[in-house]
């Protein structure tokens, strides 16, 4: 028998520095977790103790904090090289700055292979990107070799900016021939490493002949065997065992997100490359694990540029940006309109001639807007200003919901109106009229939504049975502020870009902004 230790991360999302327990900014260092310096300590400890170790990343290193905003992926290559990752799969967020924003900082600078079998380049890009990412990689591990095949969510064109010269194929269809190639090379230990979410990970384990282990990402799935060490609730045991169509037991793993845990899986193979046993658990990277001093020193060196960036002007406002709770929790506020407009702008993807865009709607809990911005400071808007408005380090995500769920959400928005509660919704691409004289649960008297399958966008009444795409904060997608119906009834959820980054990019693009209160949210009494 031959034993392999797989260490794995996924959806790190720019958390290079240690974070608080909820993966936001570290406040009390004695309680902080994760970060590359702490990760390195644990990885090195395992490498010294065990003979055959692979360190793998299942994608979405990009996007999530000011580190990515400033360094644009150079930080990912630098610190992943320093940690000596053995391979990485491309995630959807790796395309957030377009293909060039992937090629230059990461693909050309990584000293390890970057993989995806289901992304095919065409046209002029094919020769430019050739060899910079691979469908599979054979890695030497001790006296053996291990094959790694990569995959990426085929929804990436809707979630990021891969351009028109990359084709995202069905994962299972694309993976099978690559696994078959590995088999012809007499590689009999094969790991599928990818970024399509836990449901697809399980399907790959079931359907792709020859895959021995699946290491996934995208869905931030936390798996654990036994008593979990922090706040995350396990979606199943670690590893999650799938019985393949040809009768094999295939372990599937994922390690939550944000570098909070290091996935740790031990696999025993027989001489024919069959999995005999698999066991392990994610390791919580808490403060009991010291940060490596040399990596920490490097982090501090890179940090200097971030502090300078946060006080630089992004753009100007010529109007007061009303982000006060007195406005945003009671009525339409222009800060809410600005943020929603930025959210939609960030999700412009012309992927189908029939649609001017794939999504037109935004909802945003008023309680998530934490500060106004005064225009009487020469109109200057900085990252620091935006961090006061959006201090929680969330993301603006894409969900699919039925019209009936949206109607419930808008009823919830005003079910206890007048108490300055955070659930009052700010909107984009939506016109809502409330009648507060009616009883809670029956106060939405008009709800019109902007069409997407149209050449001239216009507002049409919401249809209860229709499925709509909506951009909203991850806080709402997870049922925050009492929006349980969103969490319970959503049909799809893909995590998006860092909230501050979305707004800062929009302001930089527009240069001068002047959002108005324009009748998106109205109140009426009487006959409707």
């Amino acid at each position: 028998a031959w034993e392999l230790t797989i260490l794995h991360t996924n959806d790190v999302h720019s958390r290079l520095e240690q974070t608080s327990e909820d993966s936001s900014k570290c406040v009390n260092a004695s309680r902080c977790m994760g970060g590359v310096a702490r990760l390195f300590t644990k990885v090195q400890q395992i490498r010294r103790a065990e003979p055959n170790v692979l360190l793998l990343d299942a994608g979405d290193q990009y996007q999530g904090t000011i580190w990515f905003t400033v360094y644009k992926g150079a930080e990912v290559a630098h610190f992943m090289n320093a940690l000596r990752y053995d391979a990485m799969a491309l995630g959807n967020h790796e395309f957030d700055n377009g293909v060039e924003g992937l090629i230059e900082p990461l693909l050309k600078e990584a000293k390890f292979p970057i993989l995806s079998a289901n992304i095919k380049a065409k046209g002029p890009l094919a020769s430019q990107i050739s060899g910079l990412y691979l469908p599979y990689k054979v890695l030497p591990v001790g006296d053996e070799v291990v094959g790694i095949v990569g995959y990426t969510s085929k929804e990436t064109p809707f979630l990021s900016n891969p351009g028109t010269n990359l084709v995202f194929e069905d994962e299972i269809t694309a993976l099978q021939p690559e696994v078959d190639k590995l088999k012809t090379l007499n590689v009999n230990k094969i790991i599928a490493l990818g970024h399509s979410g836990f449901e697809m990970d399980k399907l790959i384990a079931q359907k792709v002949r020859g895959v021995d282990v699946v290491v996934g990402g995208h869905s931030n799935t936390f798996l654990y065997t036994g008593n979990p060490p922090s706040k995350e609730v396990p979606a199943g045991k670690y590893p999650f065992i799938v019985t393949s169509d040809d009768g094999r037991k295939v372990p599937v793993v994922q390690a939550y997100a944000f570098g909070k845990y290091l996935g740790y899986l031990k696999i025993e193979f027989d001489e024919r490359g069959n999995v005999i046993s698999s066991h392990g658990n994610p390791i919580l990277l808490n403060s009991s694990i010291p940060e490596d001093p040399s990596i920490k020193a490097d982090i501090n060196k890179w940090r200097i540029k971030l502090d300078n960036y946060s006080t630089q002007e992004l753009g100007k406002t010529i109007v007061y940006l009303d982000g006060s709770s007195q406005s945003c929790r009671f009525r339409e506020c222009n800060m809410g309109n600005l943020i929603c407009d930025a959210m939609i702008n960030n999700n412009l993807r012309h992927t189908d001639e029939m649609f001017w865009n794939h999504v037109s709607m935004c909802i945003l809990n008023g309680g998530g807007i934490r500060s106004p911005i005064d225009e009487r400071n020469n109109g200057t808007i900085t990252w620091e200003n935006l961090a006061a408005v959006l201090p929680f380090g969330g993301t603006f995500d894409l969900v699919q919901l039925k019209g009936s769920t949206l109607k419930k959400a808008f009823e919830h928005s005003v079910h206890r109106y007048g108490q300055s509660t955070g659930e009052f919704l700010q909107v984009g691409g939506i016109h809502v009229v409330y009648d507060l004289s009616r009883k809670p649960g029956d106060r939405v008297v008009k709800l019109d939504v902007l069409c997407t399958k149209c050449r001239v966008p216009s507002y049409d009444p919401l249809k209860m049975d229709e499925v709509y795409k909506v951009i909203l904060p991850n806080f709402l997608a997870n049922g925050g502020d009492g929006f349980q119906m969103i969490k319970d009834e959503l049909l799809r959820h893909d995590s998006g870009d860092q909230d501050i980054n979305v707004v800062s990019t929009y302001i930089s693009k527009m240069k001068v902004i002047y959002p108005a209160v324009e009748g998106r949210i109205k109140f009426s009494t009487g006959s409707h």
Epitope: E109, A110, K111, F112, G131, V138, L139, P140, V141, V145
Partner: nanobody
Framework: QVQLVESGGGLVQPGGSLRLSCAAS????????IGWFRQAPGKEREGVSC????????YYADSVKGRFTISRDNAKNTVYLQMNSLKPEDTAVYYC?????????????????WGQGTQVTVSS
């Protein structure tokens, strides 16, 4: 476009020397482990030598130890194979190959990019 081009092959007498070069274009060679392989007619391709991208450590097949030396010049984006005390059994097509990773290997399966090869003939 990632490309590797070998040169320096030729006809040499037993006991003689040759220096093979492998020039890379389209990528930075210092990010890659580089290996030299050879294939004699009717035989399997065999690993001759490789050099690490991280610390410059070198590895040799037993059959060439003490006679062949691999080196790299990252500034010139080139890897060399100095072959001394050549024997008739060294006759083969010599290929250079490259892959990104941390662990040098003489296993051909781990290499992603290959040159077209240069013929080395050792004969009197």
């Amino acid at each position: 476009q990632v490309q590797l081009v070998e040169s320096g092959g030729g006809l040499v007498q037993p006991g003689g020397s040759l220096r093979l070069s492998c020039a890379a274009s389209g990528f930075t060679l210092d990010y890659y482990n580089i290996g030299w392989f050879r294939q004699a007619p009717g035989k399997e391709r065999e690993g001759v030598s490789c050099i690490s991208n991280s610390d410059g450590s070198t590895y040799y097949a037993d059959s060439v130890k003490g006679r062949f030396t691999i080196s790299r010049d990252n500034a010139k984006n080139t890897v060399y194979l100095q072959m001394n005390s050549l024997k008739p059994e060294d006759t083969a097509v010599y290929y250079c190959a490259a892959y990104r990773g941390w662990h040098p290997s003489l296993d051909a399966r781990v290499y992603d990019y290959w040159g077209q090869g240069t013929q080395v003939t050792v004969s009197s």
